[in-house]
């Protein structure tokens, strides 16, 4: 079968090979498309309800005044010339529609380095077949699930026209120290070959580099956190940041019900005071930041205290806020 590609809404003429140019003609067209369940036969003498979709012209060609999605399928003509010789024509018709130029909506004007950011949503309306959307960074294709790039896609079909609307939401994690003004664009690639891609206007968000937070220091007195029963332990939370953040205290991962203070004094230590302590500094701009954890323990008389105390890991770093 000869492959024919036709644009939706445009007329299409299919020639019936071997047909006499003028009536009387012995020919018939057979259609198997989205409008038929099996084969529909159209003849030159026809003329009727099918004329709005397909009709046989005086020269034997089949005329489709405005091709639609339902006209995709097989078209066959069988003609006999004046000498009785039979000729068959066979066409496979596929239809397409080029959408409007894609657009980036809900685009971000600023991205934060080191964390995932929504760049924007690319929208293409009115395509057939559906086609695909792809993103580009500085002209080069972005590959989803690589280097902090993720894409969420959605395809919808119009209930009446059958045309497709595509949406693609781009999330990226810009590298620290990278391009401060990256250029993003999106392009629509048609589902049928031989049609060039359509590209959006580019967007150029700024990349903001957050100032790295200096670590919250937890100082223990006595050093090492080992103390005789009845002794005193002083924990001091040192935060270089200005203005001074609020300091809260944790024991064994549970917040202590104390007012905010950079210093925690544990007088007359008893067994109930043993455990792992840390402080949490809450910055108005950065959120909470936890110190390393230190272990407070009681030394029975005659025991050697640990030289450097038992110090936990480096805490959770910057906590994610819900």
């Amino acid at each position: 079968a000869q492959n024919i590609t036709a644009r939706i809404g445009e007329p299409l003429v299919l020639k019936c090979k071997g047909a006499p140019k003028k009536p009387p003609q012995r020919l018939e067209w057979k259609l198997n498309t989205g409008r038929t369940e099996a084969w529909k036969v159209l003849s030159p003498q026809g003329g009727g309800p099918w004329d709005s979709v397909a009709r046989v012209l005086p020269n034997g060609s089949l005329f489709l005044p405005a091709v639609g999605i339902q006209d995709e399928g097989i078209f066959r003509c069988q003609a006999m010339n004046r000498n009785g010789k039979e000729t068959k024509s066979n066409y496979r018709v596929r239809v397409y529609q080029i959408p409007g130029k894609p657009e980036i909506v809900d685009s971000a004007s600023e991205l934060t380095a080191g964390v995932p950011n929504k760049v924007g949503t690319c929208v293409s309306e009115g395509s057939y077949p559906a086609g695909t959307l792809s993103w580009h960074l500085d002209g080069k294709p972005l590959v989803p699930n690589e280097k902090g790039v993720s894409v969420k896609e959605q395809t919808r079909r119009h209930p009446e026209t059958g045309l497709f609307t595509l949406q693609s939401e781009l999330m990226v994690t810009p590298a620290r120290g990278g391009d401060p003004r990256p250029t993003f664009s999106c392009s629509f690639s048609p589902g049928l070959p031989r049609h060039r891609a359509l590209r959006t206007a580019p967007i150029q968000p700024r990349v903001w580099e957050p100032v790295p937070l200096e670590e919250v220091q937890l100082v223990v007195e006595p050093e090492g956190g080992a103390v005789a029963p009845g002794g005193t332990v002083t924990l001091t939370c040192e935060v270089p940041a200005q203005p001074s953040p609020q300091i809260h205290w944790m024991k064994d991962g549970v917040p202590l019900p104390l007012p905010p203070s950079p210093v925690l004094i544990l007088p007359e230590i008893g067994p109930q005071d043993q455990g792992t302590y840390s402080c949490v500094a809450t910055h108005s701009s950065h959120g909470p930041q936890e110190s390393r954890a230190v272990s407070i323990s009681i030394i029975e008389p005659g025991e050697e205290g640990p030289t450097a105390g038992s110090v936990g890991g480096s805490g959770l770093g910057t906590l994610a806020l819900a």
Partner: antibody, heavy 119, light 107 residues
Framework: EVQLVESGGGLVQPGSSLRLSCAAS????????MTWVRQAPGKGLEWVAS????????YYPDSVKDRFTISRDNAKNSLYLQMNSLRAEDTAVYYC????????????WGQGTLVTVSS | DIQMTQSPSSLSASVGDRVTITCRAS??????VNWFQQKPGKAPRRLIY???NLADGVPSRFSGSRSGTDFTLTISSLQPEDFATYYC?????????FGGGTKVEIK
Amino acid sequence: EVQLVESGGGLVQPGSSLRLSCAASGFTFNNYWMTWVRQAPGKGLEWVASIDNSGDNTYYPDSVKDRFTISRDNAKNSLYLQMNSLRAEDTAVYYCARGGDITTGLDYWGQGTLVTVSS
Amino acid sequence: DIQMTQSPSSLSASVGDRVTITCRASQDVGIYVNWFQQKPGKAPRRLIYRATNLADGVPSRFSGSRSGTDFTLTISSLQPEDFATYYCLEFDEHPLTFGGGTKVEIK
């Protein structure tokens, strides 16, 4: 809202002529085929004529061919049926309906206008 | 020409009954069949298009089905306002042909 309003019916003598009109509103008239259907008193429905959206092609059953002519004026959103050589058996309520091709069938109908052919 | 043989020509039924009306085409008409309801002195109203699709604003108790050249209109639970005459129409070929009609009356 789609509306079709027929007019022009009445009592006429056999052999005479009558022109029916149908005023269409609420849709893009020139996107649709249009059709006339009739119903004799106490009887069923009978197709009378159809016309394509451009007005270039017209279709009739044998019972009215060469006597009736369907036409349209897309600028006026109007459909017409010119009936000549009227016979007693043409007595019926004449309905104007939207459609008539395979994409639509017949979806919206007017309220009808009565044509009586009698001496 | 295509004939559309509609049966029964009339039926008596009660509110709540399931009612089935059939049209048989004399040749293949594909899916190109409509069903209409007509009340006395009123224009026909389309119920079903392309054999099985419910027209806008039509209650879901109406449904259409097709098996080859047999087309069926079903009213799942007859309501008082459903007492009327019903017609099928084939629009695959000219002349467009209506069935003879089925009058649904109160038992």
